[in-house]
């Protein structure tokens, strides 16, 4: 649902996008994800900040928590207890890393309309959650886990050894948060709340990254983070489970690690409860090509957890690392022992498999030269998943239903023909037992969220259709977008090209390549966006291209694992190859080609600029990695192995940006980094700058004081303004 193309007579009423539009978020869209609380009910925060409960079947809705109550404690978030007796209100949000934050929590008693007084929660809390049944509370405070049987009860302390930057209970340390769990929590309630499982991370021996935070004081303070870089000592993880009904007698019981995992350095990758007395843990060797899924059972007589070898399932990759970005997690069926899981089939495509006894005897559920992306829900008779099968576009996502109750199983695409032009990239959110579900369409047209019947797939209502956005865009000259592919030497390179509104193939345009290119990433997606590059095309007349080269995801293992142990080679080659193909198309001014990227994209853009091809006039690297020895162990070693002589040290050394300092002499290079980047440390850019200075190569640079990897707030405006000036100067465009 892009605004229709206008005839020339109307063009004078249309305007191009401005940088201000982008920085103000004028054309941002909304999505609607129901906060499901049963099969047919969900909560949603209304525009005026009331928390409203909707019942789909009765069509009724009522406010369970008023905006007045929310405002009384400055709440920015809430959580209803499953017994619907209490709500926690979250305020004083204080961001830590990507997912983690601390907050103050208040418990509101819905039955008497008052806040719970007595035995109030300490502050600030690092994580808090209700049990899945009733109103038990588990929370993490000062790296220790506490339990409350009821909100007004005194807390029971589960762990005692928590220590800042040393021992983390129930929350991940930096590297597990960012690179393994992708959550702020590391504790998991069993389905009925009988048991609580949690991880303990011991960071005692991990080297610490230290950087200055300048603040406003006379002396800067030093931020210290235990951060294992490639090859360094890693966190030591243990998993414990405690009986929450009678927590004191037996205390936390450690879950044993499979012998084949425990024999060398390892990671814990995820925990999935199957029943109250069965749990599934996933482990990964430090060399991340072997993963073990271990199903453990509660032994009541001993009050311990037993993980028999017969319930260990090994997943191994011989061509790369285990899994995609992460090892996939299992979705258990109703028999509580068999499960569905996505992993590579014999042809090297990630597909859904059904595992009943052994992985070797797995039954393949989906197949083809496309990939299953995510399993949303398994019910008694259906399995819902997303894939990029439809019409062979890897950058699309559609939702499918497979009937598993009947044989042979039948497959239906739920979304493929709903709003075919507008919606080609979906995700979904299911209520209990998949009685209802919400579909959230991200594009390529204006995003829309809809509610559907889980049995018939009928659309019940539109939850959010972004009407205001649609109206706002009516007089905007948006760029044209096309997604196509290049076939080069048996490699398919999908690209997205963003073209100026009055694009004319007979003219020549400056080209900007936007690159990310990290392993298992995907940039070429059929999604809606009005962002900086939209502005560059709309107002400044640039052509922007995004190319998914080797190492990117959802097109099979051959493309994905091509970069294994060789980061910084093929990703760069494929961007260069694509640029050459774009030049051949005839509308690119080959004297005005630039490349830019952020994070991994900053690394690739830097290497592309220093490739010596003479293709690029200029480029920008924002917060780039410059040497894989500087980045996190979990991420780096997954793709590169270890930086040791007997492993892959040689390529670690060969793939640095610094090694190519000399090659920057003939390009204009803008290097940008936040000084408080906890993720890709400022060290990376500091080393690039040092190498360029030592090589007497001129370059431009911008640092953002006290900013992290996201360069948020006012820094964002400054950043995009600065990069715009740089590109316009490079392309000789007038200001």
């Amino acid at each position: 649902l892009r605004p229709p193309r206008v005839h020339n007579s109307e063009e004078n009423t249309m305007r191009a996008l401005t940088l201000k539009d982008i920085l103000n978020g004028t054309f941002s869209y909304k999505t609607f994800f129901p906060n499901w609380i049963s099969g047919q009910e969900y909560l949603h925060q209304s525009a005026d900040n009331n928390i409203v409960l909707y019942n789909i079947e009765t069509g009724q809705s009522y406010t369970i928590l008023s905006n007045r109550t929310m405002k009384s404690v400055n709440a920015s978030n809430y959580g209803l207890s499953p017994d619907r007796q209490f709500v926690y209100l979250e305020s004083d949000y204080s961001k830590l890393w990507r997912y983690s934050y601390t907050a103050t929590y208040y418990i509101y008693d819905l039955s008497n309309g008052e806040f719970v007084r007595g035995n109030e929660l300490p502050r600030p809390i690092q994580y808090l959650c209700w049990s899945p049944v009733g109103s038990k509370l588990a929370y993490v405070y000062q790296n220790n886990i506490y339990l409350k049987q009821r909100p007004g009860d005194p807390p029971f302390q589960i762990t005692f050894n928590g220590r800042e930057n040393k021992i983390f209970n129930g929350i991940p340390d930096w590297v597990y948060e960012e690179e393994m769990l992708a959550t702020k929590y590391a504790l998991w309630w069993s389905p009925n709340g009988k048991f609580l499982a949690y991880a303990e991370f011991n960071d005692t021996d991990i080297p610490v990254i230290a950087y200055s935070y300048y603040g406003d004081e006379q002396y800067p303070r030093t931020i210290n983070i235990p951060y294992p870089k490639a090859g360094a000592k890693n966190p030591f993880v243990r998993i414990f489970i405690i009986d929450t009904t009678y927590p004191a007698y037996v205390g936390p019981q450690e879950v044993p690690v499979p012998a084949m995992i425990a024999s060398s350095d390892y990671y814990f990758s995820w925990l999935t409860w199957v029943t109250d007395e069965r749990v599934c843990l996933q482990w990964l060797k430090r060399v991340q090509n072997v993963s073990v899924l271990s199903i453990c059972d509660f032994r009541e007589d001993w009050q311990t957890w037993d993980c028999p070898k017969t319930q260990e399932h090994i997943e191994e990759s011989r061509t790369g690392w285990a899994g995609g970005f992460f090892v996939s997690t299992p979705v258990f069926s109703y028999d509580a022992i068999s499960y569905y899981k996505i992993f590579s089939d014999k042809d090297g495509y990630k597909h859904i498999h059904y595992i009943k006894d052994t992985v070797e005897n797995a039954i393949q559920i989906t197949s083809g030269k496309w990939e299953a992306i995510n399993i949303f829900r398994v019910t008694q008779d259906s399995l819902f998943y997303s894939s990029n099968e439809f019409e062979d576009y890897p950058g699309r996502r559609n939702i499918y239903r497979i009937s598993i109750g009947s044989y042979p199983p039948s497959k239906k695409c739920v979304t493929c023909h709903l709003r075919k032009e507008r919606c080609q990239y979906y995700t979904a959110s299911f209520s209990d037992y998949a009685k209802y579900y919400a579909l959230v369409c991200y594009g390529p047209g204006i995003p829309i969220s809809t509610l559907h019947d889980g049995r018939t797939d009928q659309e019940i209502k539109i939850l959010e259709e972004n009407k205001e956005l649609e109206n706002a865009l009516k007089n905007i000259q948006l760029p044209k977008e096309e997604i196509k592919k290049l076939e080069v030497d048996e490699i398919t390179l999908w690209y997205k090209m963003i073209l100026p509104p009055q694009f004319d193939r007979s003219k020549k345009y400056p080209l900007l390549i936007q690159v990310y290119g990290g392993p298992c990433s995907q940039s070429v997606r059929s999604v809606f966006a009005v962002n900086w590059i939209s502005y560059l095309a709309s107002k400044e007349g640039m052509v922007i291209a995004l190319v998914d080269g080797r190492g990117t995801a959802f097109q099979g293992d051959k493309l994905l694992y091509a970069v294994y142990r060789k980061l910084g080679v093929y990703e760069v080659e494929d961007q260069i190859t694509a640029v050459r193909k774009f030049i051949e198309m005839g509308f690119i001014d080959e004297k005005r080609i630039a490349i830019w990227g952020w994070s991994y994209g900053g690394y690739v853009s830097s290497l592309a600029l220093a490739s010596g091809t003479g293709l690029f006039k200029c480029g920008i690297a924002v917060a780039p990695v410059s040497s894989w020895e500087y980045y996190a162990s979990v991420y780096t070693e997954r793709f590169m192995g270890l930086p040791t002589k007997d492993d892959n040290l040689e390529h670690y050394k060969n793939s640095t940006v610094m090694a190519r300092a000399e090659y920057f002499r003939n390009v204009d290079y803008l290097l940008i980094h936040g000084t408080a980047d906890d993720n890709v440390h400022f060290q990376n850019s500091a080393q690039i700058a040092k190498a360029l200075v030592n090589a007497q190569v001129d370059f431009q640079a911008m640092w953002y004081s006290d900013q992290n990897h996201g360069l948020s707030g006012l820094s964002t405006n400054h950043l995009y303004t600065h990069m715009t000036h740089f590109l316009k100067q490079c392309f000789s465009l007038s200001d």
Partner: antibody, heavy 122, light 107 residues
Framework: QLQLQESGPGLVKPSETLSLTCTVS??????????WGWIRQPPGKGLEWIGS???????YYNPSLKSRVTISVDTSKNQFSLRLNSVTAADTAVYYC??????????????WGQGTLVTVSS | DIQMTQSPSSLSASVGDRVTITCRAS??????LNWYQQKPGKAPKFLIY???SLQSGVPSRFSGSGSGTDFTLTISSLQPEDFATYYC?????????FGQGTKVEIK
């Protein structure tokens, strides 16, 4: 001062049921800080834990004895009891009742009864 | 079950001697180890909890240390009333298990 006192027959025939009661005085059995346990010691040998009970009735047993043991509690009488059925000569021991502190962890037996010798013999 | 092994099983010592008894668990029990003293015909008496915490009223010549699998009970200067059998006990898991005992006798 807390006191625990075991009572019950000193002689039980093989295959019959051993029954003992522990009476707690000087403190309430209905505390969330304690479990109440039974431990035995065969003549000249070491100590063996039989099981423990919470005032609410929650029990934990030694798996080696679980099929034969029942521990119960009577909060109104401030007592808890042990029943061990199908006894053999191997069950001959001094039987102790004890209080097990559980909060803060770890559990430990801080108060013991003086013990009662139960002989299994026909 | 977690096996608790004490060594030595018996020792002879004189008043004033420093005595050390060790207790080894078959698997890690963190610090969840307790020590008891038992005299003939008497119930065990509780001495130390959590590997190293002295029960109030217990003389300071008794001390405990260790964590994981290896633990020690030390009597810094043996007194006449200390001649008895000493038991370690783990409370990390079920079943609660005791060591076989170490008998401290007069030399």
């Amino acid at each position: 001062q807390l006191q625990l006192q075991e009572s019950g027959p000193g002689l039980v025939k093989p295959s019959e049921t051993l029954s003992l009661t522990c009476t707690v005085s000087g403190g309430s059995i209905s505390s969330s800080t304690y479990y109440w346990g039974w431990i035995r010691q065969p003549p000249g040998k070491g100590l063996e834990w039989i099981g423990s009970i919470f005032y609410s009735g929650n029990t934990y047993y030694n798996p080696s004895l679980k099929s034969r043991v029942t521990i119960s509690v009577d909060t109104s009488k401030n007592q808890f009891s042990l029943r061990l059925n199908s006894v053999t000569a191997a069950d001959t021991a001094v039987y102790y009742c004890a209080r097990e502190i559980i909060e803060p962890r770890p559990g430990y037996f801080d108060y013991w009864g003086q013990g009662t010798l139960v002989t299994v013999s026909s | 079950d977690i096996q608790m092994t004490q060594s030595p099983s018996s020792l002879s010592a004189s008043v004033g001697d420093r005595v050390t008894i060790t207790c080894r668990a078959s698997q890690s029990i963190s610090k969840y180890l307790n020590w008891y003293q038992q005299k003939p015909g008497k119930a065990p008496k509780f001495l130390i909890y959590a590997a190293s915490s002295l029960q109030s009223g217990v003389p300071s010549r008794f001390s405990g240390s260790g964590s994981g699998t290896d633990f020690t009970l030390t009597i810094s200067s043996l007194q006449p009333e200390d001649f008895a059998t000493y038991y370690c006990q783990q409370s990390n898991s079920i079943p609660r298990t005791f060591g076989q005992g170490t008998k401290v006798e007069i030399k």
